[in-house]
């Protein structure tokens, strides 16, 4: 479950005289290249991240799915530490993500893509708790647009992260991670799961269909998505031009 080592060396960031705290700090000191960088958030050991540099500054890619090459049905420790291939499908790791965001509110961007090639970009203002809160995700501002309102918890409600071996979901009668698949901020199981099983075609059996990658308010509950990317950026003032 370890994050694979990158083929390319991380870019040179000599201007800082230390490792950058995150992708946003890299952008703020003038880095405009996307790719793999070694960062070191406050109080954390160094680790590699995928940065995407945009007009909103530097984003850290925390999840990517597009071909089913990586098994996402993993236990708590794997979701905590991270797994996969930084050049392909991966989950960065909850502890790493939390070390990047710290106590700050953050922007979470989610790109969804269906099998017809249609894409939707969602953005949320969120707060991610530490392991003591089971990495609870809390919406800290109203959701932009019509999408997402029923897909993520209402503003203010915190949803813990759950895996099959650590059930923190909001359902008393079932373990969402077991009945679905993968680890996620499950809530009541039915709203979304971007870490589900990868399906190349729509399974006929509903029980299998439920285990897929879905985002209820976009293509419908249990429509198996073709690709997803999740990016995070700690909030401060907007990045300097």
């Amino acid at each position: 479950p370890e994050m694979a080592q990158p083929v390319d060396p991380a870019h040179n960031v000599s201007r800082l005289h230390r490792l950058p705290r995150d992708c946003q700090e890299l952008f703020q000191v003038g880095e405009r290249q996307s790719g793999l960088f070694e960062i070191q958030p406050q109080g954390s050991p160094p680790f590699l991240v995928n940065c995407k540099m945009t007009s909103d500054g530097g984003w850290t890619v925390i999840q990517r799915r597009h071909d089913g090459s990586v098994d996402f049905n993993r236990p708590w420790e794997a979701y905590k530490a991270g797994f996969g291939d930084p050049h392909g499908e991966f989950w960065l790791g909850l502890e790493k993500v939390h070390s990047i965001t710290g106590d700050r509110n953050s922007r979470l961007a989610v790109q969804l893509r269906d099998w017809d090639g249609n894409a939707e970009l969602l953005q949320f203002s969120v707060h991610l708790g530490g392991e003591d809160t089971a990495y609870s995700l809390q919406l800290t501002a109203p959701v932009a647009g019509q999408l997402g309102a029923t897909t993520v918890p209402p503003s203010g409600l915190s949803v813990p992260f759950s895996t099959w071996d650590q059930d923190h979901d909001l359902r008393r009668d079932k373990n969402c991670a077991k009945s679905l698949s993968g680890g996620w901020w499950f809530g009541t199981c039915s709203h979304s799961n971007l870490n589900g099983q990868y399906f190349r075609s729509i399974p006929q059996q509903r029980q299998k269909l439920k285990k897929g990658i879905f985002w209820k308010t976009w293509r419908g509950r249990y429509y198996p998505l073709q690709a997803t990317t999740m990016l995070i950026q700690p909030m401060a003032a907007e990045a300097a031009s």
Epitope: Q33, S34, M53, T54, S55, D56, G57
Partner: antibody, heavy 118, light 107 residues
Amino acid sequence: EVQLVESGGGLVQPGRSLKLSCAASGFTFSNYGMAWVRQTPTKGLEWVASISTGGGNTYYRDSVKGRFTISRDNAKNTQYLQMDSLRSEDTATYYCARDSTVDYFDYWGQGVMVTVSS
Amino acid sequence: DIQMTQSPSFLSASVGDRVTINCKASQKINKYLNWYQQKLGEAPKRLIYNTNNLQTGIPSRFSGSGSGTDFTLTISSLQPEDFATYCCLQHNSFPGTFGGGTKLELK
């Protein structure tokens, strides 16, 4: 359906100003960065300016810095390009483009012609 | 700044031909390369995003490949409606740079 519609182009004398608009529909405008790209027969396509989702960050190609201003009004689903001190080399078709973050420019407007000539 | 060198600038081909257009970056750009098609008087239309992903509604005769600095757009069997100008865009380095374009003409 995603739609970007530019307006405001035309013929203008060197040194004068022009303001382009781009009306967006069919998507949640405030979730996307936006940009202006221009095209000439000699130089082809070239990026002109970009603006962040909230409008607080703006970026310009060197040749237009200090003369052009990109802005947006998320309530009106519209982005703008204020072009001052226009030069003959600014003559081009100007396109509005949507920046989808992960895979960059995915949708473009139909373009608007700007001609700077005396 | 990353320079994108596109070749050839002009290409003559016949209906049914297999055609390849190349884009070379002055440094590595990961997979962040898009291909666009533009017809006279129209806006650029994205064909391929991030090296090899086909955009919605684009026929499967279009494909993209490459890595590092060298990228290719392939049209497996040219159709009459494919005669147009093609352009690449790298977005590994913000705010991105375009190739010079390839005008595909009927032989």
